[in-house]
């Protein structure tokens, strides 16, 4: 009765358990009773990242500059190229096939987390006591000016988009 299963680094072919090819190599010919599996290294622009029986290696990913992509890590025979986005851009998906500009936080919102090559800007509404009057991908909400520390009084209350306006204290006449 021929085998129906093989060990993990083997594969079943013609009632035989043959050795899989190591990462970085592709299958040229299956084993026989008397010859081992024949494998060949992937070429410079290709890779295979698992023990395999593939007859073709996979092409390395191309980081297309027209899509805002650049190489983060060059591929090897065992690993794919890793792309990232140019400055000011981030990936649209986990596989990073294209890039879009980082979003800016509108007035009334500040930057909670600055964007990276793989994640967009995270904005948060400015809480009471803070404001942002600019559209920015970097600026956090800033605290309202403290009039008291300048020996001034609030003449105009602040909002999430504007700072308070300070003015001199009214002097009472004798």
């Amino acid at each position: 009765e021929p085998p129906t299963a093989c060990r993990e680094k083997q594969y079943l072919i013609n009632s035989q358990c043959c050795s899989l090819c190591q990462p970085g190599q592709k299958l040229v010919s299956d084993c026989t009773e008397f010859t081992e599996t024949e494998c060949l290294p992937c070429s410079e622009s290709e890779f295979l990242d698992t023990w395999n029986r593939e007859t073709r290696c996979h092409q390395h990913k191309y980081c297309d500059p027209n899509l805002g992509l650049q190489v983060q890590q060059k591929g090897t025979s065992e690993t794919d190229t890793i792309c990232t986005c140019e400055e000011g851009l981030h990936c649209t998906s986990e596989s990073c096939e294209s890039c879009v500009p980082h979003r800016s936080c509108l007035p009334g919102f500040g930057v909670k987390q600055i964007a990276t090559g793989v994640s967009d800007t995270i904005c948060e509404p400015c809480p009471v006591g803070f404001f942002s009057n600019v559209s920015s991908a970097f600026e956090k909400c800033r605290p309202w000016t403290s009039c008291e520390t300048k020996d001034l009084v609030v003449q105009q209350a602040g909002t999430n988009k504007t700072d308070v306006v300070c003015g001199p204290q009214d002097r009472q006449r004798a």
Partner: antibody, heavy 127, light 107 residues
Framework: EVQLLESGGGLVRPGGSLRLSCAAS????????MNWVRQAPGKGLEWVSY????????DYADSVKGRFTVSRDNSKNLLYLQMNSLRAEDTAVYYC????????????????????WGQGTMVTVSS | DIQLTQSPSSLTASVGDRVTITCRSS??????LAWYQQKPGKPPKLLIY???SLEGGVPSRFSGSGSGTDFTLTISSLQPEDFATYYC?????????FGQGTKLEIK
């Protein structure tokens, strides 16, 4: 220290059942394929069963197929052999053994061997 | 199933002797063969894997050769601790099988 320790052996009547356990320590159990091998008194070694690292693939010697079931619990580092419909000819010392894949990246193909064995547990099937 | 036949079944030799044990497979198994040493009351110990690769910590007096159907285990100069039973095993395909063993005794 890398170790395997079998337990659960004993005397059982023909037709009875027994569950053997093998506790692994000193290595990442869930990364290794495992085997049960037995040795009848005064006889040679007989491979009994195999289980892949995930437990997805199993295989058995013809002499135990349909009666024995191998399983594993990687969270507890335990290997099991459930033995049903036991016969007198199942009397043996039962060893659990670790399958290892030896591989040198400069070489063409790797090779398997059983590099770690337990001390064994005796199973006697008798009326 | 693949059958493995070891010869001789038993062998008497002296310390310092060169000893060869053979293992023949009923079908080609390339180099998917391992050799084990077993002493009474103890589990087997892996000596050779892949027909000719020495397991770590095994003395260099042990060597393995062969491919396809014919394999040999050689002990170049027997030491007192080498008297034991030796088994070959094919790991080419399931069911995995062992040879019947070769008992090496002191003369």
């Amino acid at each position: 220290e890398v170790q395997l320790l079998e337990s659960g052996g004993g005397l059982v009547r023909p037709g009875g059942s027994l569950r053997l356990s093998c506790a692994a320590s000193g290595f990442t159990f869930g990364s290794y394929e495992m085997n049960w091998v037995r040795q009848a008194p005064g006889k040679g070694l007989e491979w009994v069963s195999y289980i892949s690292s995930s437990g997805e693939t199993t295989d058995y010697a013809d002499s135990v197929k349909g009666r024995f079931t191998v399983s594993r619990d990687n969270s507890k580092n335990l290997l099991y052999l459930q033995m049903n419909s036991l016969r007198a000819e199942d009397t043996a010392v039962y060893y659990c053994a670790r399958d290892v894949f030896f591989f040198d990246s400069s070489g063409d193909n790797g090779a398997y061997g059983m590099d770690v064995w337990g001390q064994g547990t005796m199973v006697t099937v008798s009326s | 199933d693949i059958q493995l036949t070891q010869s001789p079944s038993s062998l008497t030799a002296s310390v310092g002797d060169r000893v060869t044990i053979t293992c023949r497979s009923s079908q080609g198994i390339r180099s998917s063969l391992a050799w084990y040493q077993q002493k009474p009351g103890k589990p087997p110990k892996l000596l050779i894997y892949g027909a000719s690769s020495l397991e770590g910590g095994v003395p260099s007096r042990f060597s393995g050769s062969g491919s396809g159907t014919d394999f040999t285990l050689t002990i170049s100069s027997l030491q007192p601790e080498d008297f034991a039973t030796y088994y070959c095993q094919q790991l080419n395909s399931f069911p995995s099988t062992f040879g019947q063993g070769t008992k090496l005794e002191i003369k």
